[in-house]
Interface confidence: low
């Protein structure tokens, strides 16, 4: 690259016009403050490229760096970039203006920094002072860059005299920062809101003092920006929080909210996302299924559980046969509804030492101002079987009968069995099942009754034995889903004068 005039430093007059030319073997371009000012680009017959930058009506604000560089997308070496510094001494311009971020100088370690107060005239004497002090600090000054050195956490200003007036720069603030790897957490006051309610999200960064928050959210995509609020959590050192608050949410505000945090000093960044759902109105939804018939065992405790989702938080009531249930003082019933996640609930009805009277139709009703759900089921109390009576009789017909009566819920099954060898039964010999229709020796007659009051079945079974020629052990076994019970009687032949 060839620059004319070559520089590297030029002092030009106010209001003058000046032409800078740069040429090279590939297309070239002039840059000023990271931008490309208007310029004329050309290609000569010998294949060289040039760019001419004409500076007209120069003022002190044209003071600064100018770069000529190759105008292509490939990364080029530093020797293919030429720097030129132009001064335009201008008594109307004191210190060159700084961007706001240049006034804040952040340090993460003890290192040399530059306070970038620059003037338009390289002949001016510039001094550095603490903001509240008159004493000039012994720090070297470079007219093109500013004061460079090691500075404490203070505020500084630069001073110069132009003609007969003293000019002060803006104040520069030097901060030493706490910087670590970024740890971001995002949470919402609620992740489910109704239309018209507020969405409030918080993004918290731990361990860094200066970070930049950037939120992306559904509204932003449609160009409707929301200004987040950033604050420090004063009770926690180095906790910075950005709050995104969207009042009166709309359905379109449903979606992913992402907080991206960058820390420019070490170029760390992290982001976290959270999903927000805006619903038209509240809801209550059953999760999973509860069978319409439930069972409990007499005198045992039974917990009936219903899982549902709801927003906003619902009121939950339990009913038995349309009568509202509450925690009983006697401790027979316990009701609890607990929030297992933001919108998920588990409601439990616990019946302690279940009684027959607790059978019936149960309903759980969960509701709020927008929605309601109810779930009903029938509770059946299972009662273990009991053999209440086992008796033998000798009707005039000559046959012998054994009657077995028992109760239980659900309906008991009856099993008759007999053993002819009393000495070896039942340990060595398995008992013989009786009552099969194929056997002519015995006949069976069984009647079942349901007792509404006690909510259980009664089974009465009569076994008719045609001819008993030797003592017989007859066993009646009742079985249902929750247990079994057995009784035994010894049946002796008519001819024997005794019974065991």
């Amino acid at each position: 690259l060839v620059v004319t005039p070559p520089g590297p430093e030029l002092v030009l007059n106010v209001s003058s016009t000046f032409v800078l030319t740069c040429s090279g073997s590939a297309p070239v371009v002039w840059e000023r403050m990271s931008q490309e000012p208007p310029q004329e680009m050309a290609k000569a017959q010998d294949g060289t490229f040039s760019s001419v930058l004409t500076l007209t009506n120069l003022t002190g604000l044209d003071t600064g760096e100018y770069f000529c560089t190759h105008n292509d997308s490939r990364g080029l070496e530093t020797d293919e970039r030429k720097r030129l510094y132009i001064f335009v001494p201008d008594p109307t311009v004191g210190f060159l203006p700084n961007d706001a971020e240049e006034l804040f100088i952040f340090l993460t370690e003890i290192t040399e920094i530059t306070i970038p107060c620059r003037v338009t005239d390289p002949q001016l004497v510039v001094t550095l002072h603490e903001k509240k002090g008159d004493v000039a600090l012994p720090v070297p000054y470079d007219h093109q860059r500013g004061f460079s050195g090691i500075f404490e956490d203070r505020s500084y200003i630069c001073k110069t005299t132009i003609g007969d007036r003293e000019v002060d720069s803006d104040a520069y603030y030097v901060y030493r920062l706490q910087v670590s790897s970024i740890n971001v957490s995002v949470n919402a006051v609620q992740t489910v809101v109704r239309q018209g309610e507020n969405i409030t999200l918080m993004c918290i960064v731990i361990g860094n003092e200066v970070v930049n928050f950037e939120w992306t959210y559904p509204r932003k995509e449609s160009g409707r920006l929301v200004e987040p609020v950033t604050d420090f959590l004063l009770d926690m050192p180095y906790h910075i929080r950005s709050i995104l608050h969207i009042p009166s949410a709309e359905l379109e505000d449903s979606g992913t909210y992402t907080c991206n945090v960058t820390e420019s000093v070490n170029d760390h960044q992290d982001e976290k996302a959270i999903n927000i759902t805006v619903v038209e109105s509240g809801y209550v939804r059953l999760l999973g299924e509860v069978g319409t018939l439930q069972f409990a065992e007499l005198h045992r405790s039974r917990t009936l559980q219903v899982v549902f989702e709801a927003y906003p938080p619902p009121t939950v009531l339990w009913f038995k046969d349309n009568r509202t249930l509450g925690d009983s003082s006697a401790g027979e019933i316990a009701l609890s509804t607990r929030n297992v996640s933001e919108t998920r609930y588990v409601s439990e009805l616990t019946l302690v030492r279940v009684k027959v009277a607790e059978a019936g139709h149960y309903t759980m009703r969960a509701f709020h101002e927008d929605a309601e759900v109810q779930l009903s089921f029938q509770l059946q109390i299972n009662v273990p079987v009991r053999v209440l009576e086992l008796s033998e009789s000798h009707p005039d017909s000559g046959e012998q009968t054994v009657r077995c009566r028992g109760r239980g819920m659900p309906q008991p099954n009856i099993i008759w069995s007999a053993c002819r060898d009393l000495k070896r039964c039942p340990r060595e010999l398995p008992p013989t099942l009786l009552g099969n229709s194929s056997e002519e020796e015995s006949q069976l007659e069984t009647n079942v009754t349901y007792w509404e009051e006690e909510q259980e079945f009664e089974v009465v079974s009569t076994l008719r034995l045609q001819h008993v020629d030797r003592p017989l052990s007859v066993r009646c076994t009742l079985r249902n889903a929750v247990g079994q019970d057995t009784q035994e009687v010894i049946v002796v032949p008519h001819s024997l004068p005794f019974k065991v």
């Epitope: 809801y283 059953l286 299924e289």
Partner: antibody
Framework: QLQLQESGPGLVKPSETLSLTCIVS??????????WGWIRQPPGKGLEWIGS???????FYNPSLKSRVTISVDTSKNQFSLTLTSVTAADTAVFYC?????????????WGQGTLVTVSS | DIVMTQSPESLAVSLGERATINCKSS????????????LAWYQLKPGQPPNLLIY???TRESGVPDRFSGSGSGTDFTLTIGSLQAEDVAVYYC?????????FGPGTKVDIK
């Protein structure tokens, strides 16, 4: 657009079983937001709720009919059914299927056209 | 069961006049926790299915003309047709959905005088 359409025999003999089906179109019967119910209207009389069902199989019945009624769902066909056993002439009615929200704010907000079932020998 | 009664059994009103139907429940259907009355009104025309007009005793279903309004609380409710039109000739039923079994009133027939 949600539509409910009842279908089944228009004539049932006394003591037999009445069976009706309600086909749901334009919406899913498996929606967690709705119950699906049956209501009837005997000629010249008022409306009587028979029972309702949630897609998972949970049912609610009118106690006056409970011993004779079964409501079931077939989510694969997007339909639900009513069976009423041991019918008598008193069961002659227009039978409607209808939807009501689990959110009780909209009781029976969509109805079928209704189908007349006559019980006669 | 909650029993619903309606009065009158029938009424005839001139076109453009106001029609008022009353409905009474055998027990309160106002739920104190949310301060809502679990009552709906339906319109039933011959050969058509019932049409939901009002729910929560006073909230108009979308698409229902504003001449229909509901009021009342607890056990006493009213359906008012502000200015009767020819197409309003029908039988009107109230229904409670406070508890199962859901029950309907016997209906009120509205005709044009």
């Amino acid at each position: 657009q949600l539509q409910l359409q009842e279908s089944g025999p228009g004539l049932v003999k006394p003591s037999e079983t009445l069976s009706l089906t309600c086909i749901v179109s334009g919406g899913s019967i498996s929606s967690s937001s709705y119950y699906w119910g049956w209501i009837r209207q005997p000629p010249g009389k008022g409306l009587e709720w028979i029972g309702s069902l949630y897609y998972s199989g949970i049912t609610f019945y009118n106690p006056s009919l409970k011993s004779r009624v079964t409501i079931s769902v077939d989510t694969s066909k997007n339909q639900f059914s009513l069976t009423l056993t041991s019918v008598t002439a008193a069961d002659t009615a227009v039978f409607y299927c209808a939807r009501h929200r689990v959110m009780a704010s909209s009781p029976f907000d969509h109805w079928g056209q209704g189908t007349l079932v006559t019980v006669s020998s | 069961d909650i029993v619903m009664t309606q009065s009158p059994e029938s009424l005839a009103v001139s076109l453009g006049e106001r029609a008022t139907i009353n409905c009474k429940s055998s027990q309160s259907i106002l739920y104190s926790s949310n301060n809502k009355n679990y009552l709906a009104w339906y319109q039933l025309k011959p050969g058509q299915p019932p049409n939901l007009l009002i729910y929560w005793a006073s909230t108009r279903e979308s698409g229902v003309p504003d001449r229909f309004s509901g009021s009342g609380s607890g056990t006493d409710f009213t359906l008012t047709i502000g200015s009767l039109q020819a197409e309003d000739v029908a039988v009107y039923y109230c229904q409670q959905y406070y508890s199962t079994p859901f029950t309907f009133g016997p209906g009120t027939k509205v005709d044009i005088k």
